[in-house]
């Protein structure tokens, strides 16, 4: 059967049952995911907007799939095996009375069972297993998975020791404090810094230690994942986002219609198929576009490329290059260049590197 081909899995609670406090629902669902993460390399994180891998829904009767609920009793919940769209989603019958204890139907115990399905497990014939098809209350304070449950889930995902860092081909949420973390694109947006990676972005509000991870699609549903370059013209409230040979314009955090457009409208020659990084310098009103080992300079007022470009990155940015992943402008005098897991604070007035940092140094790692 299907399995998640990644170890970082997001979930979202779409709506809340009125039978319980919201905090109790959050806690029951979190603890249910924890039951499975304790015995596998899987890591689960809750997101509040956008497309999660696993959507938790409370619904009654017909609710958007072929498997309508049947009122109180009978079917308590169902969940779809791993996959895109409805894949992984767990639906709980709102006609049940959901509780934190032995009365009604215990949400935690039901969720452990349904999340088992969300992860790819079928039913067990062992009456002691949480994946046994019928509901039976057990003391949640002493609850443990049966040997059969553990055997089943570890046959799909392995045990927790196998949690060595995986490459990220499937756009699972990267670990923010992984020392090897690199970014696809970085830009300021007002007093915030956006760090893009795969289908996610982190939001860092200046001078505050807290950062939050979000799906790009939750903020801008029409934009693709894998943004490769980004820059801001703050005076115009504009952000430009690049992927492949296309770019999108965001004005006041809203995507403009009639985008994407071709990057060649900036005046790049045809051989340029994508932009690695971009940064706007408001002092000179110029945007620097980095492509492989070269860069172009674009005059935002005249809307045309400056003559004499491209130039080699290594020639004009001492100690930077030959290629970069991302760059942003800050504090009126610095470019922050990102190369893999390293970051360089570059004083463009002194024209030299003033600090070497890890790429994720902004997150208090």
């Amino acid at each position: 059967g299907p399995v998640w081909r990644k170890h970082y899995i997001t979930y979202r609670i779409n709506n809340y049952t009125p039978d319980m406090n919201r905090e109790d629902v959050d806690y029951a669902i979190r603890k249910a995911f924890q039951v499975w993460s304790n015995v596998t390399p899987l890591k689960f994180s809750k997101i509040n907007t956008g497309m999660a891998d696993i959507l938790v829904v409370f619904a009654r009767g017909a609710h958007g799939d072929f498997h309508a609920f049947d009122g109180k009793g009978g079917i308590l919940a169902h969940a779809f095996g791993p996959g895109s769209g409805i894949g992984g989603d767990a639906h709980f019958d709102e006609d049940e009375f959901w509780t934190t204890h032995s009365g009604g139907t215990n949400l935690f115990l039901t969720a452990v069972h349904e999340i088992g399905h969300s992860l790819g497990l079928g039913h067990s014939s062992d009456p002691k297993a949480v994946m046994f098809p019928t509901y039976k209350y057990v003391d949640i304070n002493t609850f443990r998975l049966s040997a059969d449950d553990i055997r089943g889930i570890q046959s799909l995902y392995g045990d927790p020791k196998e949690n060595q860092r995986l490459p990220n081909p499937d756009n699972s949420e990267p670990a923010l404090c992984d020392p090897n973390l690199s970014f696809d694109a970085v830009t300021t947006v007002g007093n915030k810094i956006f760090f893009f990676k795969d289908r996610f972005f982190w939001l860092k509000v200046s001078e505050r230690p807290k950062t939050s991870v979000n799906l790009i699609s939750s903020l801008w549903p029409t934009l693709p994942s894998g943004i490769e370059a980004a820059y801001e013209i703050e005076a115009r409230n504009q952000v430009f986002l690049f992927k492949d040979d296309k770019y999108w314009l965001i004005s006041n955090l809203r995507p403009e219609p009639n985008y994407p457009k071709s990057i060649h409208s900036f005046g790049f020659p045809n051989f340029v198929k994508k932009i690695d990084a971009a940064v706007f310098n408001p002092r000179f009103y110029r945007t620097y576009f980095f492509v492989d080992n070269q860069y172009w300079r674009y005059d935002e007022r005249r809307q045309m490329m400056d003559p004499g470009y491209p130039k080699l990155i290594t020639k004009n940015f001492q100690g930077i290059g030959p290629k970069i992943d991302a760059v942003f402008y800050s504090k009126n005098k610095y470019y922050y260049f990102f190369q893999g897991s390293n970051q360089f604070e570059y004083d463009f007035l002194l024209q030299r590197i003033t600090k070497t940092l890890k790429s994720n140094s902004w997150f208090g790692c």
């Epitope: 497309m51 959507l55 958007g64 072929f66 498997h67 969940a79 409805i86 989603d89």
Partner: antibody, heavy 122, light 103 residues
Framework: EVQLLESGGGLVQPGGSLRLSCAAS????????MHWVRQAPGKGLEWVSG????????FYADSVKGRFTISRDNSKNTLYLQMNSLRAEDTAVYYC???????????????WGRGTLVTVSS | DIQMTQSPSSLSASVGDRVTITCRAN??????LNWYQQKPGKAPELLIY???SLQSGVPSRFSGSGSGTDFTLTISSLQPEDFATYYC?????FGQGTKLEIK
């Protein structure tokens, strides 16, 4: 390459019966939900029936409940629709469609056959 | 029971136009909405699933958005091959269809 090939359509009188078949190839048939969807001439699409991987559960549109029976033979990679007590309003092109999922149906049809025409007329 | 209302039922547009088709459910269907394209005499083809995910091989000028009850299919710049009928669908319920014709 995934292929779904419907057969068994034709002209039948009101009250008559017909059995449609859908031969599947290019994918492992047994784990997936399968469905029948129809389209009356010049009209829109109407879902008719769906069946789970091992022959159950089965679901039907209200308009065909009690008259049509969906079944499958996983050893032959074939889906069937037995249509009894046919009415003029059952005249349509009948498509066989593969669901993207097993276990529970997502109702997401990633592959369709070319259809077979059923005409109910006296 | 869940019902899907698709609008408009027909639409005339020119090559290069941006076109939007909407689909509304009478109750929340989360993001469980799919869009299909059908050309005359052909079987429908899946374009968008789960409201906004582009099916493999479908051009990026097609995009979907929405959740809950309101959904849209957008074609950013119409191409000659896009003139067809479009259906939204959720489980066993299809919208009435939108016929997109050349102006």
């Amino acid at each position: 390459e995934v292929q779904l090939l419907e057969s068994g359509g034709g002209l039948v009188q009101p009250g008559g019966s017909l059995r449609l078949s859908c031969a599947a190839s290019g994918f492992t048939f047994s784990p997936y939900w399968m469905h029948w969807v129809r389209q009356a001439p010049g009209k829109g699409l109407e879902w008719v029936s769906g069946i789970g991987p091992s022959g159950g559960p089965t679901f039907y549109a209200d308009s065909v409940k009690g008259r049509f029976t969906i079944s499958r033979d996983n050893s032959k990679n074939t889906l069937y629709l037995q249509m009894n007590s046919l009415r003029a309003e059952d005249t349509a092109v009948y498509y066989c469609a593969k669901d993207i999922r097993g276990a529970y149906s997502s109702g997401l049809f990633d592959y369709w056959g070319r259809g077979t025409l059923v005409t109910v007329s006296s | 029971d869940i019902q899907m209302t698709q609008s408009p039922s027909s639409l005339s547009a020119s090559v290069g136009d941006r076109v939007t088709i909407t689909c509304r459910a009478n109750q929340s269907i989360y993001t469980y909405l799919n869009w299909y394209q059908q050309k005359p005499g052909k079987a429908p083809e899946l374009l968008i699933y789960a409201a906004s995910s582009l099916q493999s091989g479908v051009p990026s000028r097609f995009s979907g958005s929405g959740s809950g009850t309101d959904f849209t299919l957008t074609i950013s710049s119409l191409q000659p091959e896009d003139f067809a009928t479009y259906y939204c669908q959720q489980a066993g319920i299809f919208g009435q269809g939108t016929k997109l014709e050349i102006k």
